[in-house]
């Protein structure tokens, strides 16, 4: 990037520890409950650095053997947490993400908690519920959304530069007027992407131009005055 | 078919006691939790308690904790309720309801045993 | 203890019009996302039927003009259109956690 920036504007979210509850809306439920062996699964995004619960179907202690959730993370080996009523005893397998906890004893809340979610946790959580007659499951596939990095610059005559960086998923760049653009995508190893869009107006009454970067954690909008070319007449509005 | 079968009407004495019973077929007995609810003549629903035949849990309401007495038969799939020192408040409807797993619900309900407490 | 307050206590609705039951919650009646409320059917004589089960699910085999709405501490039971087989008395439930408790019922007649 070039060091005669002549105008930077930045936006980067401040994120405070919100809590997102991935506990399925009773609306959502498609499925008919009256028989065991009953399953859904929901995709969930949630943005990086909040605290997420996850719950497990609407079963009741007194109705249950075993809650397992199973933990699959990539590149990790599967992660269970399991509680067996009857001896009162929790038991964990392969977890080693400190963060990723039950809420409170299983015997009183059967939910999972991540407290401030990384990009780690992106994976798919299930609960199981054994019962006598059967096993009920709730799945989710976790996406950790990451807000990017927002900054618009100019670089060089009447051309633009509008940078969405490090994002997950990747940012959408749109500009208004439209001009002559060009976009490059770049991946990181830790499954952000950086979206950068380049743009020239040759029309020179357009003085003032907008980034408008379009993500899942929100939406923003820069906008710069285009410096204009020296010795160029400016054509009347 | 689930089927929930109750005993027939009782007509019985203040003071004394009444047991009645709930005979479910058409599924696995310990397998689900047995609820008893009571209906007054004219009135609404109230909760009474319930038994889980697979380890015999059982839980009242507060109210109902000195009057039922909750049991259960493993071997004739069938919950009893006795209801004890009987008064004129005590002649309702009594009915039994099996608890679904999803959502606590009761899907399938006894057809109810009338209680009438009269000297 | 959540106490369901239900309202009206009565109402006359026309054949083939929509009739609206509410209940009340004395407390939200939501635990891990879920609205334990419940809504049955009682006519004389015979024991409450399951209608709704957690605030808006149709039971199997209830016809779909019974629907259920609500969250938190207010929830909705509408039925439209009404038929003549559906003058009954209404109950909302609670079963989230002990005591369960039921609301006071609605009688619904057609007129």
């Known amino acids: 990037q070039p060091n005669n920036s002549l105008m930077l504007q930045t936006s980067k979210e401040n994120h405070a520890l919100a809590s997102s509850s991935l506990c399925m809306d009773e609306k959502q439920i498609t499925q008919n409950y009256s028989k065991v062996l009953a399953e859904v699964n929901t995709s969930w995004p949630v943005k990086m650095a909040t605290n997420a619960v996850l719950c497990c179907p609407p079963i009741a202690l007194r109705n249950l053997i075993i809650i397992t959730w199973e933990i699959i993370l990539r590149g990790q080996p599967s992660c269970t947490k399991a509680y067996k009523k009857e001896t009162n005893e929790t038991k964990e397998t392969n977890c080693t993400d400190e963060r990723i906890t039950w809420v409170s004893r299983p015997d009183q809340n059967s939910d999972l908690q991540i407290r401030t979610v990384a990009i780690t946790h992106d994976g798919y959580y299930r609960c199981i519920m054994v019962t006598p007659d059967g096993n009920f499951h709730r799945g989710y596939h976790l996406q950790v959304l990451v807000t990017p990095e927002v900054t618009l610059f100019q670089n060089r005559n009447r051309t633009a530069v509008c940078k969405a960086v490090a994002g997950k998923p990747a940012a959408h760049i749109s500009w208004i007027p439209e001009g002559d653009c060009a976009t490059k995508q770049e991946y990181w190893s830790n499954g952000t992407v950086t979206v950068k869009s380049t743009c020239h107006w040759e029309v020179h009454n357009v003085s003032t131009v907008t980034c408008h970067v379009s993500h899942l954690t929100g939406n923003k909008s820069l906008y710069i005055e285009l410096l204009p070319v020296p010795g160029a007449k400016k054509s009347a509005k | 078919e689930v089927q929930l079968q109750q005993s027939g009407p009782e007509l019985v004495k203040p003071g004394a006691s009444v047991k009645m019973s709930c005979k479910a077929s058409g599924y696995t007995f310990t397998s689900y939790v047995m609820h008893w609810v009571k209906q007054k003549p004219g009135q609404g629903l109230e909760w009474i308690g319930y038994?889980?035949?697979?380890?015999?849990?059982?839980k009242h309401n507060e109210k109902f904790k000195d009057k039922a007495t909750l049991t259960s038969a493993k071997s004739s799939s069938t919950v009893y309720m006795e209801l004890s020192s009987l008064t004129s408040e005590d002649s309702a409807v009594y009915y039994c309801?099996?608890?679904?797993?999803?959502?606590?619900?009761?899907?399938?309900w006894g057809q109810g045993t009338l209680v009438t407490v009269s000297a | 203890d959540i106490v369901l307050t239900q309202s009206p206590a009565s109402l006359a609705v026309s054949l083939g019009q929509r009739a609206t039951i509410s209940c009340r919650a004395s407390k939200s009646v939501r635990t891990s996302g879920y609205s334990y409320l419940h809504w049955y059917q009682q006519k004389p004589g015979q024991p409450p039927k399951l209608l709704i089960y957690?605030?808006?699910n149709l039971e199997s085999g209830v016809p779909a003009r019974f629907s259920g709405s609500g969250s938190g501490t207010d929830f909705t039971l509408n039925i439209h259109p009404v038929e003549e087989e559906d003058a009954a008395t209404y109950y909302c439930q609670y079963s989230g956690e002990l005591p369960f408790t039921f609301g006071g019922g609605t009688k619904l007649e057609i007129k």
């Open positions: 957690l605030a808006s």
């Open positions: 309801a099996r608890e679904e797993y999803y959502g606590s619900r009761f899907a399938y």
């Open positions: 038994i889980h035949p697979y380890n015999d849990d059982i």
